[in-house]
């Protein structure tokens, strides 16, 4: 942005100038895009409630497990196996847990009557030994149950293991009982109390409403709001078998999802319950499958502290509460509308892409000549010309050349390096269309000058026969009227240019050249048109008229103002103008780049 110069510069506004194309096809595309985008924006606004300010849920959970299990334990007493029946209630099979979790024991292994003394390790790959050399005093293996004494002692029969100082007898390494001892835990129920809060919206609620029938049991379709869950049903929902999981234990997630619409006109805030198995059911045996932990019951016998070690297998239930509460918010609505406005520009991007593609050189030269059905697309070239103004970077090397015997203009954007401008090929660019309204500015003298004696009144064409080359004309001259440049050697090649590419009549012989470029009357008119009160002495008048004549020629032959700025006049025209409006003394300076 330009720097502020005055107060008036602050109070201004810039806007873009646009091109409106009256086209059925592009109009249809535009409205198609707009309708689709508008439909999507409205759909997303309503379906995702993007007009609401959303806040995450804050929650607290409390659980109560109910149920009784009969357990049949097989114990060995004095070498005899016995079946013992016992009843497990809530206090026996649940353990206090932190956070939103509760645990239900489903299986266990007991090691009774342990006391602290020396005894052989339970036989495993790591504890079996053949001599004391296989044991090390003070060694504590992570898998071991005690501290080695360094002795290899008999465990049973001919099996020898390292002796340890530990709670003895050492817990046996054995599999969990099959089927699970508390298999009937499948019928236990759990009541989940969940209070939630959206502090930003000042809204609190809970999953248990006052009128709830507390004898209900949750069912996904028949009773989806009941907060009492049968453990077996939870596993059935996830496609797992409770009896299988009960053997080794596992972790189950109970998800409570609150999607609350807190708007008065659409108020809805009830939980959705779902279940997810959270432990890895495919775990290798060596990576400890399931869920278990050990705990001990301590007691004293004959003043000796003893314990019963229980390895507990069971299911940990993790209650995961998540969700959002949303309420209408004008700021959210405005932000959403603002973020979607840019999508409406997609139509313009797409249509511009079509115009640019169909007006490309590739289409013009390779597709349109062969594909008849593509012919209507040629109109895009017209749209493109109206829409785009191409500007060439005004480098010091930029020059435009116009030959009277060629329909196009040549752009030369390179250093000449001693070559005549006449011989440099350059790049062909189309000649701009003539704007005939400009002619109306010219003086009446140009429109109705009396016929010159000896010349017919019809349009004067250039003579077809070539002008005989004069002995003075340079090798690059094709019209016979050019003169050598007076510039230094380094700049001379810039003026080595003829009005023609091939031999023929010179443009200076054209009647229009005389009327447009050499007419003192016309040139004076043009100078006064720019500066009405211009008063000049003879020398400066000639200089002004000469440069005006250069400009007239450039505008006539190159059409575009931008091209005229970088136009190089042929030598014949340059010298003809200089002859008409000579410089009283000194050298002619030649072409200078305007930038």
């Amino acid at each position: 942005m330009p720097a502020c110069c005055s107060c008036s510069d602050v109070f201004q506004y810039e806007t873009n100038k646009v091109t409106r194309i009256q086209s059925m096809n592009y109009g249809t595309i535009k409205w198609f895009f707009h309708v689709i985008i508008f439909s999507y924006v409205c759909f997303a606004l309503v379906s995702d409630k993007l007009y609401q300010r959303k806040e995450p849920v804050i929650s607290s959970v409390h659980t109560k497990v109910k149920g009784i299990a009969e357990v049949k334990e097989e114990i060995v007493e004095n070498g005899v196996k016995k079946l013992v029946h016992s009843v497990f209630d809530t206090a026996d099979y649940t353990f206090p847990l932190q956070g939103n979790s509760f645990f239900v024991m489903t299986n266990f292994l007991k090691t009774e009557g342990q006391e602290q003394r020396l005894c052989p390790e339970y036989p495993t790959r790591r504890t079996l030994c053949s001599s004391d050399r296989g044991c090390k005093k003070g060694w504590m293996d992570p898998q071991s149950k005690g501290i080695q004494t360094g002795r290899c002692v008999v465990y049973e029969g001919n099996q020898k293991t390292c002796e340890v100082s530990a709670w003895c007898p050492i817990e046996a390494v054995e599999e969990a009982p099959r089927p699970a001892l508390l298999n009937s835990a499948e019928n236990f129920t759990v009541l989940i109390k969940n209070n939630i809060d959206f502090p930003g919206h000042n809204y609190t609620t809970r999953n248990i409403l006052p009128g709830l029938n507390i004898t209900c049991t949750f069912h996904k379709t028949q009773n989806p709001q009941c907060p009492i869950f049968r453990l077996g049903d939870i596993f059935r929902e996830t496609g797992d078998n409770f009896s299988d999981v009960a053997i080794q234990g596992g972790i189950m997630g109970i998800e409570i999802y609150w999607d609350c619409n807190l708007d008065r006109w659409f108020h809805h805030c009830r939980p959705k319950y779902s279940f997810r198995r959270l432990d890895d059911k495919t775990t290798n045996v060596s990576l400890y499958p399931g869920y278990n932990f050990r705990y001990a019951k301590y007691y004293k016998e004959n003043n000796v502290e003893k314990r019963t070690l229980i390895k507990v297998f069971g299911i940990r239930f993790d209650i995961l509460v998540f969700g959002t509460g949303g309420k209408f918010d004008i700021i959210q609505l405005v932000v959403y509308i603002g973020s979607t406005l840019s999508y409406f520009g997609l139509a313009a991007v797409f249509i511009d892409f079509l115009i640019d593609t169909y007006s490309s050189n590739c289409c013009r030269s390779h597709i349109y000549p062969w594909c008849k059905c593509c012919q209507p697309c040629v109109v895009n070239e017209y749209y493109y010309r109206k829409k785009c103004e191409s500007i060439v970077e005004p480098k010091p090397t930029l020059k435009y050349v116009s030959f009277v015997d060629e329909s196009h203009i040549r752009m030369v954007n390179q250093q000449l390096l001693g070559r005549s401008l006449q011989d440099v090929k350059g790049q062909e660019v189309p000649r701009p269309a003539m704007d005939f309204t400009d002619l109306s500015r010219l003086p009446l003298a140009l429109h109705d000058t009396p016929p010159i004696p000896g010349q017919p009144e019809e349009i004067q064409l250039l003579r077809k026969e070539a002008t005989p080359r004069s002995r003075d004309s340079p090798v690059w001259c094709q019209c016979g009227s050019c003169l050598p440049s007076q510039l230094p050697e380094s700049h001379r090649c810039l003026e080595e240019l003829c009005c023609r590419k091939k031999p023929g009549a010179c443009i200076t012989t054209s009647e229009l050249f005389r009327k447009l470029v050499l007419s003192r009357h016309v040139l004076q008119f043009l100078l006064l048109y720019q500066e009405p009160l211009l008063a000049l002495d003879v020398d400066s008048t000639n200089s002004r008229l000469r440069h005006c004549a250069y400009r007239c020629y450039a505008t006539w032959r190159f059409g575009s103002q931008d091209m005229a700025d970088f136009a190089i006049l042929p030598s014949c025209c340059r010298w003809r103008i200089r002859k008409e409006f000579p410089k009283s003394e000194g050298q002619y300076s030649g072409f200078k780049s305007p930038y």
Partner: nanobody, 129 residues
Framework: EVQLVESGGGLVQPGGSLRLSCAAS????????MGWFRQAPGKEREFVAA???????DYGDSVKGRFTISRDDSKNTVPLQMNSLRPEDTAVYYC???????????????????????WGQGTLVTVSS
């Protein structure tokens, strides 16, 4: 699961040398401690030499200074170089492997046959003039 194949056994004169090799299959070879054991007719299986997955070695008292164990994890082989052989070295030599994936075998237990889960079929070495 690892399969072990011993090779290089045969008849050798006392004071001679022999190189046994144990080839193991399986991509996790580098996680195994490897050992050589021998069993003479009518005797119990005896520890010869062992090398852990991290390269520490142990030798039986009767072969110390004469036998050398090494391992080539790129070729999945464990060679046993036996020098200054004696007639009492005559036995079937077995290659064994102990999985150390879940915990290294302590050095003082490398000689324990109980540590080794996988065993080869054995190769006979006879030292006789």
């Amino acid at each position: 699961e690892v399969q072990l194949v011993e090779s290089g056994g045969g008849l050798v004169q006392p004071g001679g040398s022999l190189r046994l090799s144990c080839a193991a299959s399986g991509r996790t070879f580098r996680h195994y401690a490897m050992g050589w054991f021998r069993q003479a007719p009518g005797k119990e299986r005896e520890f010869v030499a062992a090398i852990s997955s991290y390269g520490s070695t142990d030798y039986g008292d009767s072969v110390k200074g004469r036998f050398t164990i090494s391992r080539d994890d790129s070729k999945n082989t464990v060679p046993l170089q036996m020098n200054s052989l004696r007639p009492e070295d005559t036995a079937v030599y077995y290659c064994a492997a102990a999985d150390e994936t879940l915990g290294a075998v302590p050095n003082f237990r490398l000689h324990e046959k109980y540590e080794y889960e996988y065993w080869g079929q054995g190769t006979l070495v006879t030292v006789s003039s």
